[in-house]
């Protein structure tokens, strides 16, 4: 906190300029009018103030706007944004995507800070949903942003926004998140033709049900093993050997290297060994030839 002292004669700031870096902290407090600072915030971003001087400028803005800064000031905060607390940011009403971008730029290259997380939360809540432009912006700055949302939060993403999602944006998503995103992606890409559709939907397939995988197996998609390994185990288990062969195409050979890992391991246990042998990959662990597989519900009906 800087003591309240009168501004020395001739030092009253008429504009925000480089000469202010030569002011001591108490002189900045005494000689810079907060309203002038608010209207010329963009200039602060071009002047190499010390961190201590910036603290004084923030203090002046806090006094001028105890209920929270107006967006005209927020847009030009620059580095001062990083000096804000989440409590400060919760007082703001940020509606412009340009303001959001300007503040995200300041933090670019760093992990998502508590300030940024609070800002994004305020912005998205203000908009009511995660629209395409917002999602585009957020994933550009933070590729993992989408996967940081809960399934409940993801449910507010409209299908149209899915067009903004890149494969790397889904890298850290878990199956519960993909369960929410997959139906939206399916809806978003429904008018695309086979090969184009597969390219777009591929990253979301960790949320796909069995019937959709069966349908894809009829389209010569040649799914790679990395994608296959991310599929839901419960969706893979009912697939036949022939369907998996069609689904993977030339990549089917990769099953051998993954035979001890889920979902491949569990799928193998459900297949007849003679069906697995048709692949010629040496996959072992299937149901031995000559064994009957009885559905328990069927067994009860027989007795």
């Amino acid at each position: 906190e800087v003591e309240k002292t009168a501004c020395p004669s001739g030092k009253k700031a008429r504009e925000i300029d480089e000469s202010l870096i030569f002011y001591k902290k108490w002189e900045l407090e005494a000689c810079v009018d907060a309203a002038l600072l608010a209207t010329q915030m963009d200039r602060v971003n071009a002047i190499p103030f010390t961190y201590e001087q910036l603290d004084v400028l923030k203090h002046k803005l806090d006094e001028l706007y105890p209920q929270g800064y107006p967006e005209s000031v927020i847009q030009h905060l620059g580095y001062l944004f990083l000096k804000m607390s989440p409590e400060d940011i919760r007082k703001w009403n940020v509606t412009s995507l340009e303001t959001l971008k300007a503040l995200l730029e300041v933090n670019k290259g760093h992990e998502m800070s508590p300030q940024v997380a609070t800002l994004i939360d305020r912005f998205v809540k203000g908009r009511g949903q995660l629209d395409k432009d917002t999602l585009d912006t957020l994933t550009a700055f933070y590729p993992g942003y989408l996967c940081s949302l809960s399934p409940e939060e993801l449910s507010s993403v409209p299908p149209s926004s899915i067009w903004a999602v890149r494969p790397q944006d889904l890298d850290t998503c878990d199956p519960r998140q993909l369960d929410v995103l997959y139906p939206k992606a399916r809806l978003a890409f429904q008018n695309m033709n086979g090969s184009e559709y597969f390219v777009k939907i591929q990253s979301f397939l960790g949320g796909a049900p069995t019937e959709d995988l069966k349908a894809l197996s009829q389209q010569n998609v040649s799914m790679d093993l990395a994608t296959f390994m991310k599929l839901r185990t419960d969706a893979v288990l009912p697939l036949t050997v022939a369907e998996v062969q069609k689904l993977l195409g030339p990549h089917v050979e990769g099953l051998k290297a993954e035979e001890r890992h889920r979902p491949v391991r569990d799928w193998i246990l459900r297949q007849r060994q003679d069906d697995l042998d048709t692949l010629g990959l040496g996959l072992q662990g299937g149901i031995p030839n000559g064994y009957l597989v009885l559905d328990l519900s069927m067994q009860e009906a027989l007795s």
């Epitope: 602060v44 620059g78 944004f81 670019k108």
Partner: nanobody, 115 residues
């Protein structure tokens, strides 16, 4: 973002030193740079500043006519030429920068002793 100052040392009154400020891991070219100094037990004070293009320079009254700030964007370095040094110029000298979107960079300082 880290800046690195160098060129400090011990010099006699009336002598000269040239301080350098270079960027570590990024380029300084679009950063406006300020030189500051802090004497023991005193507040940090501004010494000079230079715009990103080098077209605009400013000086504190206490160093006007003695210090000159310049930049060589080809070498990604900003200089502070200090002539006619006085004992009261003794301090740790820091450079601080401001770039696009108000991004800030600062250094650890270099010590200047005039004695």
């Amino acid at each position: 973002l880290q800046l690195v100052e160098s060129g400090g040392g011990l010099v006699q009154p009336g002598g000269s030193l040239r301080l350098s400020c270079a960027a570590s891991g990024f380029t300084l070219d679009n950063y406006a740079i300020g030189w500051f100094r802090q004497a023991p037990g005193k507040e940090r004070e501004g010494v000079s500043s230079i715009s990103s293009s080098g077209g605009s320079t400013n000086y504190a009254d206490s160093v006007k006519g003695r210090f000159t700030v310049s930049r060589d964007n080809a070498k990604h370095t900003v200089y502070l030429q200090m002539n006619s040094l006085k004992p009261e110029d003794t301090a740790v000298y820091y450079c601080e920068g401001v770039g696009d979107y108000g991004r800030r960079a600062m250094g650890q300082g270099t010590s200047v002793t005039v004695s």
